[in-house]
């Protein structure tokens, strides 16, 4: 990352103006943003959200931490070991494996800030990479050479 | 989000202690973190990263913004309109569609902070939801009822 100047306001600025604005821009809800309410089974549906129509279907599991931003993260959990047949949407095709796709997401943790003499002076945000599973993907198995 | 107290340090705290720590924890590199160097073609490889072994293969496109955290985001771009056959990994099966999976990711933008009289007083972080495409997924086409 390139260096950013300190994001803190200048000395003496009134801290009632919160540095980090929590309001979000209005964005239409997107499929992976919340768990789906379709029946969780190893089948590829012909309607509903992407994770239930996929031939490597998955469900979402909530991971909530009130000291983290974002506070709510969702982890994908595969519903089948193999891919579902495109022909029937219900039988498994063992020629394909359903594998989790992982991603290191940037998150921020609220940590106590310490003053000059180690005293507690409000809160700081600490950036971390956090491993999340995004989706299940149908792949051809690796060929061992 | 539950309300967090102001993340700014108390009045008079030395702002040389940067509020947001940029250092990251060491995390093993994961496949989707960077674009793959495999040939970009509509085929499911038998080796390499997940995005090239998928029967809905995709490439990554860099989206860099130095005034945003994370500064680097990757958008998935599907390499095939349909899924690739599990039989061969190199010919398409029109019974399946390769569709992008979208996600609203929390990002932070650096914005000028304004003091009591509208004067520029350092920088603030503003939270936004940013739409990213995470992967391409092989799905059964929607049946229109």
């Amino acid at each position: 990352y390139s260096h950013w100047p300190s994001c803190c306001p200048s000395k003496g600025q009134d801290t009632s103006e919160e540095l980090l604005r929590w309001s979000t821009v209005p964005v239409p809800p997107l499929e992976p943003a919340r768990p789906n309410r379709h029946p969780e089974s190893c089948r590829a549906s012909e309607d509903g959200p992407l994770n239930s129509r996929a031939i490597s279907p998955w469900r979402y599991e909530l991971d909530r931490d009130l000291n983290r931003l974002p506070q709510d993260l969702y982890h994908a959990r595969c519903l089948c070991p193999h891919c579902v047949s495109l022909q029937t949407g219900s039988h498994m095709d063992p020629r394909g494996n359903s594998e989790l796709l992982y991603h290191n997401q940037t998150v921020f943790y609220r940590r106590p800030c310490h003053g000059e003499k180690g005293t507690h002076k409000g809160y700081c945000l600490e950036r971390r990479l956090y491993r999340v599973s995004l989706a299940c993907v149908c792949v051809r198995p690796r060929v061992m050479g | 989000y539950s309300h967090w107290p102001s993340c700014c340090p108390s009045k008079g705290q030395d702002t040389s202690e940067e509020l947001l720590r940029w250092s990251t924890v060491p995390v093993p590199p994961l496949e989707p973190a960077r674009p793959n160097r495999h040939p970009e073609s509509c085929r499911a490889s038998e080796d390499g990263p997940l995005n090239s072994r998928a029967i809905s293969p995709w490439r990554y496109e860099l989206d860099r913004d130095l005034n945003r955290l994370p500064q680097d985001l990757y958008h998935a771009r599907c390499l095939c309109p349909h899924c690739v056959s599990l039989q061969t990994g190199s010919h398409m099966d029109p019974r399946g569609n390769s569709e992008l999976l979208y996600h609203n990711q929390t990002v932070f933008y650096r914005r000028p902070c304004h003091g009591e009289k509208g004067t520029h007083k350092g920088y603030c972080l503003e939270r936004r939801l940013y739409r990213v495409s995470l992967a391409c997924v092989c799905v059964r086409p929607r049946v229109m009822g």
């Epitope: 022909q87 039988h91 020629r95 | 085929r43 056959s85 599990l86 061969t88 190199s90 010919h91």
Partner: antibody
Framework: QVQLQESGPGLVKSSETLSLTCTVS????????WSWIRQPPGKGLEWIGF???????NYNPSLKSRVTFSVDTSKNHFSLKLNSVTATDTAVYYC?????????????????WGQGTLVTVSS | DIVMTQSPDSLAVSLGERATINCKSS????????????LTWYQQKPGQPPKLLIY???IRESGVPDRFSGSGSGTDFTLTISSLQAEDVALYFC?????????FGPGTKVDIK
């Protein structure tokens, strides 16, 4: 009636490149998948790979690093190049057409074969 | 890769008698969604290319005499010649087309006793 005919040199020097062409007559090369298969003298059959008229290929991993297929729809033929040959590449080389199952969108068995051409690798 | 094995390596059968060739795949080649076995049988006579006899394990190719039949499912398959004729003397191969790389059995040589 679809007919396939292999052509190319019958003798290739060790470490050089084996080049063969399969000419298709009695039907179009388009819309089908075309394979190369070889058979060492007195032995079994080995699938080398296939090519589609669009140029999409699939190679046997055992030969992938040395093999290249190409197709010329205007001449209704497809070709094989196998580089860095050794004596173990001595074989009868066949070209064949895959049956294509439009119900499953999958490749079936080989329904038409060429007569085959013997390629000997000499040291 | 899927390994195909055949037994016996060779067999000699009297004219008009039954000949049975077995083929085994190292993994299941039945796809339950279509209930199809991705197995085919070829006949090869000396100096000729292989000729397609049976596909989907049991479907006879057009023009193939009905004395040839295929059976089996999953990993175990059989080619049967119900009444051996002189023109059936040949090498017989099984092949899987379930997944690439497509692989062949080593062959079974059929002779007349």
């Amino acid at each position: 009636q679809v007919q396939l005919q292999e052509s190319g040199p019958g003798l290739v020097k060790s470490s050089e490149t084996l080049s063969l062409t399969c000419t298709v007559s009695g039907g179009s090369i388009s819309s089908y998948y075309w394979s190369w298969i070889r058979q060492p003298p007195g032995k079994g059959l080995e699938w080398i790979g296939f090519i589609y008229y669009s140029g999409s290929t699939n190679y046997n991993p055992s030969l992938k690093s040395r093999v290249t297929f190409s197709v010329d729809t205007s001449k209704n033929h497809f070709s094989l190049k196998l580089n860095s040959v050794t004596a173990t590449d001595t074989a009868v080389y066949y070209c064949a057409r895959h049956y294509f199952d439009s119900g499953t969108y999958e490749l079936g068995p080989f329904d038409y074969w060429g007569q085959g051409t013997l390629v000997t690798v000499s040291s | 890769d899927i390994v195909m094995t055949q037994s016996p390596d060779s067999l000699a059968v009297s004219l008009g008698e039954r000949a049975t060739i077995n083929c085994k795949s190292s993994q299941n080649i039945l796809l339950t969604s279509s209930n199809k076995n991705y197995l085919t049988w070829y006949q090869q006579k000396p100096g000729q290319p292989p000729k397609l006899l049976i596909y989907w394990a049991s479907i006879r190719e057009s023009g193939v005499p009905d004395r040839f039949s295929g059976s089996g499912s999953g990993t175990d398959f059989t080619l049967t010649i119900s009444s051996l004729q002189a023109e059936d003397v040949a090498l017989y191969f099984c092949q899987q087309y379930y997944i690439t790389p497509f692989t062949f059995g080593p062959g079974t040589k059929v002779d007349i006793k």
